[in-house]
Structures are given as C-alpha cells and as structure tokens.
Amino acid sequence: VPEAFLLFSRRADIRRISLETNNNNVAIPLTGVKEASALDFDVTDNRIYWTDISLKTISRAFMNGSALEHVVEFGLDYPEGMAVDWLGKNLYWADTGTNRIEVSKLDGQHRQVLVWKDLDSPRALALDPAEGFMYWTEWGGKPKIDRAAMDGSERTTLVPNVGRANGLTIDYAKRRLYWTDLDTNLIESSNMLGLNREVIADDLPHPFGLTQYQDYIYWTDWSRRSIERANKTSGQNRTIIQGHLDYVMDILVFHSSRQSGWNECASSNGHCSHLCLAVPVGGFVCGCPAHYSLNADNRTCSAPTTFLLFSQKSAINRMVIDEQQSPDIILPIHSLRNVRAIDYDPLDKQLYWIDSRQNMIRKAQEDGSQGFTVVVSSVPSQNLEIQPYDLSIDIYSRYIYWTCEATNVINVTRLDGRSVGVVLKGEQDRPRAIVVNPEKGYMYFTNLQERSPKIERAALDGTEREVLFFSGLSKPIALALDSRLGKLFWADSDLRRIESSDLSGANRIVLEDSNILQPVGLTVFENWLYWIDKQQQMIEKIDMTGREGRTKVQARIAQLSDIHAVKELNLQEYRQHPCAQDNGGCSHICLVKGDGTTRCSCPMHLVLLQDELSCG
C-alpha cells in the first residue's frame, strides 16, 4: 500500500507530511511559486497541481518537484478552486475573479468554460467523476453550495443556507460532503444532496482548509496556526498534526484511495476527440474547446469559422455570437506588450497584430503556436526605425498593408515577412488607420495631416488617389469596410461619433453620436457594426438595418485597442478572385479592374516592365 501524505499550500511553499511515519513537514522543491492557493493531485501520474494567485497560473510538477510546468497561463484572475478529474484526465477550476468554472485536459489543452452565468465568486471545487457530478461553493451575496454535471449541465443549489464555505471535500466511501464555514467557524457535513446536515465541530476558532481520509477529517486552523484531525463522524479524538503553520491555503491527502472508481472517460477518453466529460449517472458526453462545436457524430469538434476578435493592451480575445451566449476567451498568445491593431487571415487561420511597445507586426495561430515576426522594429542596414500603426490584410494577394507613424508611409509586406515596398508617401502625409478592399482594388486610409485630417481612397498601388472627406473630421481614428454592403465606416475620437458612406464617399451619414467617449476600433459583423470604446471599457454594436438599434455587447473590459470580425471564407468565391491564383501572375501588386480583369503594378521605387507582370 503506498504511503499517504498530507499536502498543503502556504504562499510560496507546497509541503508534505507523511501520515504514517509522522514525519515533519518537508517542502516539495518547486521554484517560482509565489502564492499557491488550491491544490490537487493525479495519483497515477504522481503529479501535483496547484493554482498561483499572484502569477495567475495553474501549474503542475511531479511529487519530487521535477518537470514543473504551467498548464494554464491565460485568462485567470483569482483561481481559488481547482480539482483533478482523475478518470477523464481533466482539470477543473473555479475563478472568483472571472466568475467562471472551466475545464481543460490535464496539460491545459482544449479549455472550455462550463459554468459562467449567475456565478458569484465560485470558490471551493470538488469532483465526483464516477458519478459525473461536480460540487462548488459560492462566496458572493448569497453564499451557497451548488452541484452540476461535470459538463456544466443540470445545475442545482444543494445548500442555500450556509456561510462562505471552503475546503469542500467528498468522502467517496460514505457518500458525504464536508466543508468549513468561514462565517460560523463550523465544520459541517451533509449527504450528497445537501441533506442530512450535521455539525462535526463547532468550537474551532478559524477552520479554513479541509480534507478527508479514511476515518478522519483533516483541517487547517488560521487562528491556532495548525493542521488538526478528528473523527469524521463524531468530531472527537482530535489531534494536532502540525503546529506553527500560518495561513495554510489548501490541504489534501495524497493517496490512491482518494482517486478510485471508473467511468467511460477512463477508457480511451470515451473515444472523444477533445474532452470527455462525465455526466450522471456513469455516463459521459464529448466536449469541445471553447467556441468549437460538437459535430453530428457527437465525438469530434469543429473550429469556429465566424467570430469576433478584440484586443486589449496585453491580450487578444475571441468572442462568438451563439444561442448559449458563450463567454469570450483569451487566446493563449505569449509576450503581448501593447497590442495596437489586429487582423486575421481566414485562409491560413492566422492572427496578425501590431505591438506598439515592440514596434513590430507579428502573427500566430489561435492556439499561440507558430509565432512569427512579420515586420521587425528596425532595419539596421537602412538605419530605419519603424512604428507600425495599423494593418489590413489583402487575403487574395497574401499581403499586409500597414501604416507607419515613424515614416508616414503605407507599406506592403508579404504574409511571410518579405517586403513588397512602399505604395504611398507624401511630404505632408500622415496615414494612420487603413482598410483594404481587394475585391475592388482599393485601399482606404485616414490621413491625419496637421489641422486638415482627411479620409482618402487610393488604388492598392497608391495611384488613383482621391480625398473622400476633409470636412466634418477632427481625429478619424478607425475605419471599417463592408464590401457586401458597399459601405465605409469611421469613428472620430475627437468628435465622438461614428459615420458611414458609400465606398465612393457618397451618402455620408452619422450613425451614432450619443454616449461615445473614446471609440478606438470598428468592425462589421453580419448586419451589425461593432465598436469599442476605450474610456467606457465597452464593446457595443448598432444594427445597420435600423431594426434593432444599439446594443451593449460587453462592459468592463480594460485597455481595449481594436476589434475585428472574422467571417467564414467561401473557398469557391475566394478562388474566383483573379489575384487569388499566384497573385494574378504579378511579381508585386495585383489589382482588380472595374471589368473584373487584373492589372499588375509596382511599389513606388519600382516600375512595371514590358511583360506587364514584373517590376524592376
């Protein structure tokens, strides 16, 4: 029989005490732990898992401290509850800051939000994977203990009349729940339905963490600075296991008897492609990562093809518009310092962004992999410093058009990072926001010339340049375009209004000019125009058909910087574009003419050669 250990977390420490040899506590040799909170383990792997409130991570390591890795590093606020599903090999956690209960595989893959509506500071979390239930406590306005199936369905309140409950623990053998109540300083127990409630201890100064093993409950007391144990039914036969321990956050017993049983997920992941989630009684459902949808086979998942991306200073988020109002998620992209602008290539499913702290354009897959710097911050050979401001992708030619604050030009760069050249440059020009319309061969940009801001249009090679608007503008900061509707949209951050026109500049109208404080990004998504307001920390939308008006999409999102809609790419339509096949045969810029044919063109420093395809 393997040895049983008490494991406990105490700020930068995770320590163990043998329950058999009564060893003194021994620190597990972990580096970089700052504020360990919730703890759990996977006995078959001999690994421990913990949340770190300060680092905002969930990590794991072997019991000897080796192979330490962060398994969840994004989108955590205060992950104060966490539990291992040892049968499905899933990780569950509750976050009192985001008010979400989430799940992923033990390595952090395939993350999904299970419960997010009407959650008020979810705290302690316990799993019963053999039965398919999860249990948690809430510390909000009305503290309670809730239960749901392990896929988040069938939610119910078990114990409504309770204080802020912590240390929620299941006695799997005797089918009882145990918890500490921080408001009454009681240790209580109930059956698995929250009934047959009993007080196990009522004379403790400050019980906090709690666990159960065999005939005993073990708890931490913040007042007595101790770990103690007592008989789990009578509360008698109390023993101090260890004293002089301040503020122990979580406690558990590491032993195989705490992780027994079987369910369908324990066998080949239930033949699910991503998550296998236990449900009552003894059943399972296949689950998908956030925003993915379960296919008709009920086993495999498909990635979203239509969604919204929005950026904050150091995060890029994805949002889907669906019936269940799925919550937005942070994409796991590292080293974002100051995201200024975002775009997306639906063909290669890659995200592009400008980081204005690092002064570069980067790209990555949505899962954070294949990170690559497309445009670097300086070109030493040319003694050139750049400051990318905005970008727009021509998906057909596979080019990025981007403006630069330092050089005040419009550049074109291939998606693989190779330079095409400068297409627009003028002594007085200050091009800033940009959006391309490759379907028609044009680009639109704001020109923030001193005292005379303009919105202009030019062909994608910088020719045919014309000013669309020069009056009624102060600081046009963002542009959006809908080729299907034939509309251009812009936001003016000084005038605090959003306007639109036809793509030729005709039919200019003010769409919205009330209660807009600092619009910084616009995008068109189906029949809606979405915008972000940095000052109000809000995403809003307006129905362009005029039927539904203005709607608040999401509030309290700090440091918003950009928003971009992604719609499903129709490959048939895509291939019909004359520039989609090998850039229309052009060496540099491929333009669609009014009759649907193409012409090749060149950046400013080159001229078109006699073959009318190449530049030299």
């Epitope: 700020r11 930068a12 420490d13 409130i53 300060s54 301040d246 503020y247 956050m249």
Partner: antibody
C-alpha cells in the same frame, strides 16, 4: 508569539540619513510581505515601502522613491529601511507591518510598536 | 493611485449605539479592502480583511461589507473600548492606500 520590533529612529537634520530596522520573530519571515507604514504627527497612515523577502520584490511610494531603500536579511529575520535625503515632511512614526499576501487579500495582520523619526534642523 | 475616501471624518456616539463608517474607492478594488482600529500612541490593529471577513480574535460586533468601490464598517453595539480611529485600506493595486481615518468619540 509573533513580534515585530522597530528600531533606529531618532532626530536627524534635513538631507541626512537614517536606517530603520524591523526584527521579526515567531513566524516564517520569508512567507510574508514586510511593509513600512508611517504616520505623521496627528495625521493618517501612509504606506511607504514593502518587500517580499523570499523573492526580493520591492515596491515604494512615489514620495520616497529614489531616496528610501527597503531590504531584508533572511538569515537575521530582519527588514531594513534606509532613508536618505530626509526632509521635514518625512517626520513620522514609522511602523513595520507584515502581510501574508493573498490569504488576507493584502491586509496587514501584525504591526510593530513604531519608531519615531524626526527631521529637523 | 487609488484614493480611499472615508466618511465621516469624525463622529460622536454613545455606548450601545450602532455605528457605520463608509469608505469609497476611486476605482474598483474588488474586495481587497481591510479595516483597522488605532488608539492613541498605539499601532493599528486589523479588524476586517477582504472587505467582510472578521479577523481572528476580533469581537463579532464588528462587521464589514461591500465590494467594488463602496465599503462599510459597522459596529453593531459600541463598547467603551471601541472609541478609537478607524482606517480603511485597499490592497488591490500597488501602492496600498489608506483612507484618512474616522475618529469615533464619546458623545
């Protein structure tokens, strides 16, 4: 028994220096943030600086940044506040306090008795 | 920096009275607020942490509530030893900041 004992206060001229000590006992020193908080005569509490001895992380109030330095000697379970370029407005009782971090959401659960620093010519 | 504004700055009350002191943060501080009691010539003592949790050994007549920007310290039945100055403090962001204090005096 948890104890925090400050020492090193006294009278010093403007522009002068002083080093305060905070000797900690009765708890695991490296598991706590150690703060210096001051209170000018008849006034409220003002946070000055903090250190997390385990990691060496430090923070300072803008009013003392560049003049004061907080440090800790984990072998002696002692935190220090080196105060240079002292000004009349630095006159206060200086308290040393500890915080267990997230456990109490940053609250300071034990305070020393304080040491008086008077900056005057 | 986050400002913590306490009110009132002073109040007079009698033994047995219910006393309420409020603290308003200049921006959202979640529940990262503590309350301290200080008597003349003494160091502050922690009463409430995380907005509403009673610190060990503190009498249950003290309670705290609130979240976001508005917080309250309540003494349900004022006792002679409760006459002191009370401070709120936020620890949501660095630097931690204190309210200016509320002096509770005998009427």
């Amino acid at each position: 028994e948890v104890q925090l004992v400050e020492s090193g206060g006294g009278l010093v001229q403007p522009g002068g220096s002083l080093r305060l000590s905070c000797a900690a006992s009765g708890f695991t020193f490296t598991n706590y943030d150690i703060h210096w908080v001051r209170q000018a005569p008849g006034k409220g509490l003002e946070w000055v600086a903090s250190i997390y001895p385990a990691g060496g992380d430090t923070d300072y109030a803008d009013s003392v940044k560049g003049r004061f330095t907080i440090s800790a000697d984990t072998s002696k379970n002692t935190a220090y506040l080196q105060m240079n370029s002292l000004r009349a407005e630095d006159t206060a009782v200086y308290y040393c306090a500890r915080s267990p971090g997230w456990a109490l959401r940053g609250a300071m659960d034990y305070w020393g008795q304080g040491t008086l620093v008077t900056v005057s010519s | 920096d986050i400002q913590m504004t306490q009110s009132p700055s002073s109040l007079s009350a009698s033994v047995g009275d219910r006393v309420t002191i409020t603290c308003r943060a200049s921006q959202d501080v979640s529940t990262a607020v503590a309350w301290y009691q200080q008597k003349p010539g003494k160091a502050p003592k922690l009463l409430i942490y995380s907005a509403s949790f009673l610190y060990s050994g503190v009498p249950s007549r003290f309670s705290g509530s609130g979240s976001g920007t508005d917080f309250t310290l309540t003494i349900s039945s004022l006792q002679p030893e409760d006459f002191a100055t009370y401070y709120c403090q936020q620890s949501y962001t660095t630097p931690p900041t204190f309210g200016q204090g509320t002096k509770v005096e005998i009427k």
